[in-house]
């Protein structure tokens, strides 16, 4: 018995179709991805193949404007306009809370959202009982198929889930699950959930009677063959892990942002065990023409947007510095309030021995794209935003050793003077420099501010300990140079989407008024 | 609006066959799964299996397998349950209803009472 | 195969009076759970489903609750056109399994 599994995951908010770097879509004829297109292609391989399944791993939430204006409602319309089988919750569902997620997408999706380790306490328990599922048993063809999800169990650290959700481990909350679903008979199980690929991995691995792991969280491309775009596959699609007891599970996941589609062949024997797996996930090109009913859909919700972009969010009532000859030479106040920007979107009380779990921001000045006049009655629109972080970025959370930091720190004045990227912003930490030393060896002081305290203060950088980041994706991608933090990252967890962070905290403070306030010295 | 028509009822002979169609309207037939349910006079319902109306993909209950056939027609949009080698046993009202985006049943057909009757 | 039992299998009621029917199901069925009212010579009607959504057009004065493997509907404020027999249904795996039924009589 063959079953075809179709799967998306971290898509982002990425409802239209976009560049090839998934950014705003600029050259129609390049451009890839989009909800009218994948719906083409799932609709043409549900006509060809009799039993198909169409899986997302998480992370719809989160990414473009389309998520600031609608807060789910998109997701949930547009997912069910593709008739997708199964969700599995991400981290970055609870982005707005819990009942940013029950309102939006658990009350209007028209499929199952699932996942096994999220247990509700107090309160909530009544409220959000059967919205989520730990599991679903569908009917495929002439079979059952059981579905069981999981969700990232460091949620509480990188999303806003509230006091009322425990997440457990994954393995010890899957188990007991997919016994039960052997019990009753269900022998082809799928585990599909949002914790990376290490821990999918894992999970092949441990979780007896897993047949097959339809990831997310860490955006893994994986490919056979010659890869048919920029990305470079982790490993062949499906990646094969032999679990404990010999079965031999494939493991797939389909890179991020609606690119692709995961496409994964799978033959069963009759008693539910795996026979063969192979696939690819499909470039969703402009070769695949965007479906028109969904298209036209698209531009009707697309109205909305337009007219968001240029209402107010807030006041400055200080010119917001954020020309290159600033940020790119000194302390500017722009990075000044994109990085408390990013902290502020970071605070998480999850233990009373900390204020909170990460105190630091980094931020390329090259990466701020444009100032800030306060003298247009001080008003600041998502517009104005969208032209200082105009990439469509992310601000993402990461791990760190304090050696890693330093060396980027000398490598953020190793050239310095000559109104390059990577000259970093900072929030959080001091920094001297004494550019009268040689490249390498320029930083005379760094302290940052310390988490593990009732009264934050600034301590000397120790160069072993390990600790938490907020920066833009594309230094933790190892961007201008900053290779050290791509090889030496310890963790790394995708943020939410950059001009969102920094339109909520202006729409919170309501009126700014950053200062250049001596975070960065020169000696 | 959503309905489900079956046809009259039926008084057969042991040992014979019957078809029962269940003509759906008011939705897109393949968008949703029929199920096919069992009550005897007097008793509880009893589940019998499930179709898909797109690729006719069906799923029955152990105790009915040999006993049903489950079939669609998707240019009529028509549902349709074969009951075969019918004994007294067999004697109830059948009810086709279709299921939601949950596969929980919604919408129900109004029956088809089925004797067998020598 | 999962056993739903429910209860009381009769029970008599006044106008205007709060009622409660449960189920329970033989081990946890994950809000699985379907409610359905039927009339003498009438089809079965879905009142609920997922344990506590109602289905489109059926009144306010019908709830369902529960999870794991007890369930129960209310009728907020008993109608004459609610009496019947109710029937609970587990969906959450196959083969689907009904409860036996509660007869609601009027008092």
């Known amino acids: 018995w063959e079953l075809t599994i179709l799967h998306t995951n971290d898509v982002h908010s990425r409802l239209e179709q976009t560049s090839e770097d998934s950014s705003k879509c600029v050259n129609a004829s390049r451009c890839m991805g989009g909800v009218a297109r994948l719906f083409t292609k799932v609709q043409q391989i549900r006509r060809a193949e009799p039993n198909v399944l169409l899986l997302d791993a998480g992370d719809q939430y989160q990414g473009t404007i389309w998520f600031t204006v609608y807060k789910g409602a998109e997701v949930a319309h547009f997912m069910n306009a593709l008739r997708y089988d199964a969700m599995a919750l991400g981290n970055h569902e609870f982005d707005n809370g819990v009942e940013g997620l029950i309102e939006p997408l658990l009350k209007e999706a028209k499929f199952p959202i699932l996942s096994a380790n999220i247990k509700a306490k107090g309160p909530l328990a009544s409220q959000i009982s059967g919205l989520y599922l730990p599991y679903k048993v569908l009917p495929v063809g002439d079979e059952v198929v059981g579905i069981v999800g999981y969700t990232s169990k460091e949620t509480p650290f990188l999303s806003n889930p509230g006091t009322n959700l425990v997440f457990e481990d994954e393995i010890t909350a899957l188990q007991p699950e997919v016994d039960k679903l052997k019990t009753l008979n269900v022998n082809k199980i799928i585990a599909l959930g949002h914790s990376g690929f290490e821990m999918d991995k894992l999970i092949a691995q441990k979780v007896r009677g897993v047949d097959v792991v339809v990831g997310g969280h860490s955006n893994t491309f994986l490919y056979t063959g010659n890869p048919p775009s920029k990305e470079v596959p982790a490993g062949k699609y499906p990646f094969i892990v032999t679990s404990d007891d010999g079965r031999k599970v494939p493991v797939v996941q389909a890179y991020a942002f609606g690119k692709y589609l995961g496409y994964l062949k799978i033959e069963f024997d009759e008693r539910g065990n795996v026979i063969s797996s192979h696939g690819n996930p499909i470039l969703l090109n402009s070769s695949i023409p965007e479906d028109p009913s969904i298209k036209a859909d698209i531009n009707k919700w697309r109205i909305k947007l337009d007219n968001y972009s240029t209402q107010e969010l807030g006041k400055t009532i200080v010119y917001l510095d954020g020309s290159s000859q600033s940020c790119r030479f000194r302390e500017c106040n722009m990075g000044n309030l994109i990085c408390d920007a990013m902290i502020n979107n970071n605070l998480r009380h999850t233990d009373e021995m900390f204020w909170n779990h990460v105190s630091m921001c980094i931020l390329n000045g090259g990466g701020i794209r444009s100032p800030i006049d306060e003298r247009n009655n001080g008003t600041i629109t998502w517009e104005n935003l969208a032209a200082v972080l105009p990439f469509g970025g992310t601000f993402d959370l990461v791990q760190l050793k304090g050696s890693t930091l330093k060396k980027a720190f000398e490598h953020s004045v190793h050239r310095y003077g000559q109104s390059t990227g990577e000259f970093l912003q900072v929030g959080g930490i001091h920094v001297v420099y004494d550019l009268s030393r040689k490249p390498g060896d320029r930083v005379v002081k760094l302290d940052v501010l310390c988490t593990k305290c009732r009264v934050p203060s600034y301590d000397p950088l120790k160069m072993d300990e390990v600790y938490k980041v907020i920066l833009p994706n594309f230094l933790a991608n190892g961007g201008d140079g900053f290779q050290m933090i791509k090889d030496e990252l310890l963790r790394h967890d995708s943020g939410d989407q950059d001009i969102n962070v920094v339109s909520t905290y202006i729409s919170k403070m309501k009126v700014i008024y950053p200062a250049v306030e001596g975070r960065i010295k020169f000696s | 609006q959503v309905q489900m028509k079956q046809s009259g009822p039926e008084l057969v002979k042991p040992g014979a066959s019957v078809k029962i169609p269940c003509k759906a309207s008011?939705?897109?037939?393949?968008?949703?799964?029929m199920d096919w349910v069992k009550q005897s006079h007097g008793e509880s319902l009893e589940w019998i299996g499930d179709i898909n109306p797109n690729n006719g993909g069906t799923i029955y209950n152990q105790k009915f397998k040999g006993k049903v056939t489950l079939t669609i027609d998707k240019s009529s949009s028509t549902a349709y349950m074969e009951l075969r080698s019918l004994t007294s046993e067999d004697t109830a009202v059948y009810y086709c209803?279709?299921?939601?985006?949950?596969?929980?049943?919604?919408?129900w057909g109004q029956g088809t009472s089925v004797t067998v009757s020598s | 195969d999962i056993q739903m039992t429910q209860s009381p299998s009769s029970m008599y009621a006044s106008l205007g009076e709060r009622v409660t029917i449960t189920c329970k199901a033989s081990?946890?069925?994950?809000?699985?759970l379907s409610w359905f009212q039927q009339k003498p010579g009438k089809s079965p009607k879905t009142l609920i489903y997922?344990?506590?959504r109602l289905i489109d057009g059926v009144p306010s004065r019908f709830s369902g609750s529960g999870s794991g493997q007890d369930y129960s509907l209310t009728i907020s404020s008993l109608e004459y056109e609610d009496m019947g027999i109710y029937y609970c249904l587990q969906y959450d795996v196959f083969p689907r399994t009904f409860g036996g039924g509660t007869k609601l009589e009027l008092k």
């Open positions: 997922r344990a506590n």
């Open positions: 209803a279709r299921t939601n985006w949950d596969y929980a049943m919604d919408y």
């Open positions: 081990q946890d069925i994950n809000s699985q």
């Open positions: 008011g939705y897109t037939f393949t968008d949703s799964n």
